[in-house]
């Protein structure tokens, strides 16, 4: 049987060692013990007795089916306990009695049906994170389950087979920063929502089929809900259930962020928010994020005109990887407060972008992200976006552009341009001189000779440059990142000619460890203040004798350097 490996600070790793029991030889010097992915099955009375100073105990996926009642009696210092993904079919309050310092407890993925006969957690007054439940058997949430817990940073409940929710079960926890609920159906959603309204600041709903969700007024007094963020992940919605969900917003007037990740909309976007007061109650929502939205009939999707007014005050919208090919002009014009728009990984082409960025579109927009779409012409893209008078940042990375022309037009306030991973081979004066930040990393550039008088940051890593660009091109440059090119050397003169340079990241290049370079690095200890990842990423490529040595450690031969 393999043994534990422990470092000097008492962190012990025993993962995947085929242990069939808690190993012997544990000591009070141990601060952290990870025995995940073993075959331990049983934790008995004295197995952990010696670990009086243990702060972290991780027993994930170790086939544990039995824990004696006082197995943790000596672990008064324990702060982190992970018992997830084991075979515990019932839970005992006696395990947790001694764990008064516990801050993190993960009981998820064990085959229990309830959290036990009595309250499990009354002594865990320092608990901050609690994860409970499982996919198949956890079926009941009761009023006693959370007794003694008054405040949690994170509570995650996996209850995909929930058959009974006892009213007010979650109400006893007065403050929950982030509640994650895995519910397969919406049957108990309204009841739970009523109980958490006055305690939860961020509610995340996972894997829930909301297709049949129907709103009914909540049995709550006037509450000032602290909820600021609402997220749906892996949920299924219809046009009708979306309308019903909107009605919940009247209870969470401070909501500022809504997120939909990996959701499916079985509908056509034919939303009809029936209650006019919903519109005003969306007033505080500033951020809407949609990622990987699957719309089976996306080719029949409506123009969303019914929700235009809902989004007039929204400041940040992300719709990523969701087959967006057009934001209708009239919709863009309604997004009057929009400052940030991210349409990454979609199907935008210049022809439709022109309609989206029509006259009067997105009048407050400052940042536009069109990364990984189907744009081809940099010139056309710049021209189309001239309507965006307040645009300062544009990310058009990961589009495959045709070679850039000599001149282009861009929005006049533009200061930031991301052209990384666009396949460009040459930079030309198409790039605007107003830029303060330019990212051209991961391209095919073998030189850079463009004068950019205001440029403060240049990102040009993962290209084919053999030397640092000429400093006279960037009189006010503060940051240059030029990793993973073919730069063979840099000198005192070169670095000295960048009058304002504060940060240079030039690791993982092909350095020729000449006498000059090595002398310079030896004589200039201040390099460590400018060079990011110095000295570990700065290695000699040649001569062969020094290949793989760090520049800092390499020593030229006296013979070579005094010829």
């Amino acid at each position: 049987q393999e043994s534990l490996s422990c470092d000097a600070s008492g962190v012990c790793d025993g993962r995947s060692r085929s242990f069939t029991s808690i190993p012997s030889g544990l000591t009070a010097a141990m601060k952290s013990l990870d025995l995940s992915f073993n075959k331990i099955t049983y934790i008995g009375h004295g197995d952990l007795r010696a670990c009086a100073n243990l702060q972290v105990l991780i027993l994930k996926s170790s086939r544990i089916n039995t824990i004696e009642g006082d197995a943790f009696y000596s672990l008064g210092s324990l702060e982190h306990l992970d018992l997830s993904d084991n075979h515990l079919s019932s839970l005992s309050s006696s395990w947790f009695g001694p764990l008064s310092s516990l801050k993190y407890l993960n009981l998820m993925g064990n085959p229990y049906q309830t959290l036990g006969v009595t309250s499990l957690f009354p002594n865990l007054t320092n608990l901050q994170t609690l994860r409970i439940g499982n996919v198949e058997t956890f079926s009941e949430i009761r009023r006693i389950d959370f007794a003694g817990l008054t405040s949690l940073n994170e509570l995650e409940i996996k209850a995909l087979s929930l058959r009974n929710y006892q009213s007010q079960s979650l109400k006893s926890i007065r403050d929950i920063h982030h509640l994650t609920l895995h519910l397969s159906e919406s049957a108990f959603l309204l009841e739970i929502f009523a109980d958490i309204l006055s305690s939860v600041r961020y509610l995340e709903l996972r894997d829930t089929n909301l297709a049949r969700f129907q709103f009914s007024p909540l049995p709550v007094d006037e509450v000032s809900s602290p909820m600021k963020k609402l997220a749906f992940r892996g949920s299924v919605l219809t046009d009708e259930s979306f309308n019903e969900l909107l009605k919940l917003l009247r209870y969470i007037l401070e909501l500022s962020e809504v997120e939909f990740d990996d959701c499916t909309l079985n509908g056509l976007g034919d939303f009809n928010p029936s209650e006019s007061d919903v519109v005003s109650e969306l007033g505080k929502v500033e951020t809407v994020t949609i990622r990987r939205l699957h719309i089976p009939q996306f080719y029949l999707f409506y123009d969303l005109s019914t929700v235009y007014s809902l989004l007039e005050k929204v400041k940040r919208i992300t719709v990523e990887n969701s087959k967006v090919f057009l934001v209708p002009c009239s919709f863009s014009q309604h997004l009057k407060s929009l400052e940030f728009l991210d349409l990454s990984e979609n199907l935008m082409v210049e022809e439709y972008l022109k309609n989206s960025a029509c006259k009067g579109a997105w009048p407050s927009l400052q940042t536009l992200v069109l990364s990984q779409n189907h744009l081809r012409s940099m010139q056309k893209t710049g021209e189309i976006l001239l309507t965006l008078k307040n645009l300062t940042s544009l990310d058009i990375s990961r589009n495959t552009f045709h070679p850039m022309p000599d001149s282009c037009q861009w929005p006049e306030k533009m200061r930031f341009l991301n052209l990384s991973s666009t396949g460009i081979r040459v930079v030309k004066t198409c790039i605007p001189q107003t830029l303060e930040v330019l990212d051209v990393s991961n391209n095919n550039l073998d030189s850079f000779s463009l004068f950019l008088p205001r440029l403060q940051e240049l990102y040009i890593s993962r290209n084919k440059l053999k030397t640092l660009p000429d400093a006279s091109l960037f009189p006010v440059l503060l940051v240059m990142k030029i990793r993973e090119n073919a730069v063979s050397t840099f000198s005192k003169d070169q670095l000295g000619s960048f009058p304002k340079l504060e940060t240079l990241e030039a690791g993982d290049n092909h350095f020729v460890c000449s006498c000059e370079l090595l002398s310079f690095t030896m004589e200039t200890p201040a390099l460590a203040q400018i060079l990011v990842d110095w000295p570990d990423s700065y290695l000699c490529d040649s001569p062969p004798r020094l290949h793989g040595h760090r520049l800092q450690d390499a020593r030229p031969s006296v013979l070579e350097c005094h010829q």
């Epitope: 049983y42 008995g44 824990i67 004696e68 006696s94």
Partner: nanobody, 127 residues
């Protein structure tokens, strides 16, 4: 009805060895935790050792550490206690115990943990 029958006790010289056996019958013991306790005349019953159903986890009381070894033969539903370097203070009646229930809210060093008990076998160590 579950029955536990101990055997292997007897008289032994100081420094000698004995192997106690505990045979279980009348039920499936594949998931049982087996334990050994002892009781000297005029004293309380004392925990000696226990072993889990698969033999994966063993635990010893202070008196047994380093000298006694608990093992089990799952096929024969039998538990064993090999006792080496016996001393006169090891003289006692040795009891076998078994826990059948799956829920563990108490400790295996306590008598209340176990559901079934044998009648005991006498061990006498002479000087």
């Amino acid at each position: 009805e579950v029955q536990l029958v101990e055997s292997g006790g007897g008289l032994v010289q100081t420094g000698g060895s004995l192997r106690l056996s505990c045979a279980a019958s009348g039920s499936t013991f594949s998931k049982a935790v087996m334990g050994w306790f002892r009781q000297a005349p005029g004293k309380e019953r004392e925990f000696v050792a226990r072993i889990t159903w698969n033999g994966g986890s063993t635990y010893y009381g202070d008196s047994a550490k380093g000298r006694f070894t608990i093992s089990r033969d799952i096929g024969k539903t039998t538990a064993y206690l090999l006792m080496n370097s016996l001393q006169p203070e090891d003289t006692a009646n040795y009891f076998c115990a078994a826990r059948m229930r799956p829920v563990f809210s108490s400790s295996s060093v306590q008598e209340s943990f176990y559901d079934y008990w044998g009648q005991g076998t006498q061990v006498t160590v002479s000087s």
